[in-house]
């Protein structure tokens, strides 16, 4: 039975040209995290494999940095970066947990972070 929950940074906004950290945290389970995949609308951004380390997709090498932790840093943001991001935790023995973050990239300097929320 999957008992864990994913806590994410929720709905967030950031300024065009700036950077943002996407963070997820898996709690309430003793399952071992074997890999975390980061996706943007079905497109792979990055992989963090427990044994093999990080892979940043070639399409995003110039604008994506690994970390902190299992998180991901997006740099040089554009309005086109607005959208859904997913952290997919592959665990043993539980299986897969998915967290969702919605990022809005704003033209103006009015960029406030949304509240944290949980996805079971």
């Amino acid at each position: 039975m999957m008992t864990g929950t994913i806590e994410t940074t929720g709905n967030i906004s950031a300024e065009k040209g700036g950077s943002i950290i996407l963070q997820c945290h898996l709690s309430s389970t003793t399952a071992q995290v074997t890999q975390v995949n980061w996706e943007q609308q079905d497109q792979l951004l990055a992989i963090c494999n427990a044994d093999l380390g990080w892979h940043i997709s070639p399409s995003f090498k110039d604008r994506v940095a690994p970390g902190p932790g299992l998180g991901l840093t997006l740099q040089s943001l554009t309005v086109n970066d607005t959208g859904e991001y997913f952290c997919i935790y592959h665990t043993y023995p539980d299986g897969t947990y998915t967290g969702r973050i919605f990022l809005e990239v704003l033209e103006s300097s009015v960029a406030e972070h949304g509240a944290r929320f949980q996805i079971p």
Epitope: G53, W54, H55, P58, K61
Partner: antibody, heavy 122, light 113 residues
Framework: EVQLVQSGAEVKKPGSSVKVSCKAS????????IGWVRQAPGQGLEWIGD????????NYNEKFKDRVTITADKSTSTAYMELSSLRSEDTAVYYC???????????????WGQGTLVTVSS | DIVMTQSPDSLAVSLGERATINCKSS????????????LAWYQQKPGQPPKLLIY???TRESGVPDRFSGSGSGTDFTLTISSLQAEDVAVYYC?????????FGGGTKVEIK
């Protein structure tokens, strides 16, 4: 030792499709990319695309994007490359290869299948 | 797409002599985060699949003789065979794996003079 074993040679008619398989053993199939490269007779190497089975993420060379589909079956550790609307220029040896593109190892295409000759002829 | 240009197309070298193959990319292959160049070299003998020789510009794959070495950074790279052996007769390809689509050089045929 990682091994990639490909399906046998194929002779196809123009306009038809071919599906080549690549069965992996001796490694963790889901954790590495499986890429496809072709080589026309007497020519160089051309990258077609790849798949990361641990998420079924695919990347295609734009040249082939409308005609190629790369899939993977984790349960059998087998990757597939299907090329449609075949023409005589597609006659080539098709290779699968394991890709290691992690930032800490980055060994590129380190293990290769034996190749599958696809002949397109009317 | 990143264009990989190899030179020369073919090379004839005496046994025991040095063979040098050049590869030039149309864009830098240096990844600033880990300071690695995403450039590999392969050897292909007739009727066989390519074999990985060197990755990240200069790291020899396990089991590859130390007479093979790679160097370079950014856009200019070199594969050197310090003392050519009969079994080194093959076609050599460079490949970039920095950005999609991954691309290969046109190949350099190495023969014995």
């Amino acid at each position: 030792e990682v091994q990639l074993v490909q399906s046998g040679a194929e002779v196809k008619k123009p306009g038809s499709s071919v599906k080549v398989s690549c069965k992996a053993s001796g490694g963790t199939f889901s954790n590495y990319w499986i890429g496809w490269v072709r080589q026309a007779p007497g020519q160089g190497l051309e990258w077609i695309g790849d798949i990361y089975p641990g998420g079924a993420y695919t990347n295609y060379n734009e040249k082939f994007k409308d005609r190629v589909t790369i899939t993977a079956d984790k349960s059998t550790s087998t990757a597939y490359m299907e090329l449609s609307s075949l023409r005589s220029e597609d006659t080539a040896v098709y290779y699968c290869a394991r890709g290691d593109y992690y930032d800490s190892s980055g060994r590129a295409m380190d293990y290769w299948g034996q190749g599958t000759l696809v002949t397109v002829s009317s | 797409d990143i264009v990989m240009t190899q030179s020369p197309d073919s090379l004839a070298v005496s046994l025991g002599e040095r063979a040098t193959i050049n590869c030039k990319s149309s864009q830098s292959l240096l990844y600033s985060r880990n300071q690695m160049n995403y450039l590999a070299w392969y050897q292909q003998k007739p009727g066989q699949p390519p074999k990985l020789l060197i990755y990240w510009t200069s790291t020899r794959e396990s089991g590859v003789p130390d007479r093979f070495s790679g160097s370079g950074s950014g856009t200019d790279f070199t594969l050197t065979i310090s003392s050519l052996q009969a079994e080194d007769v093959a076609v050599y390809y460079c490949q970039q794996y920095y950005s999609y689509p991954y691309t290969f050089g046109g190949g350099t045929k190495v023969e014995i003079k």
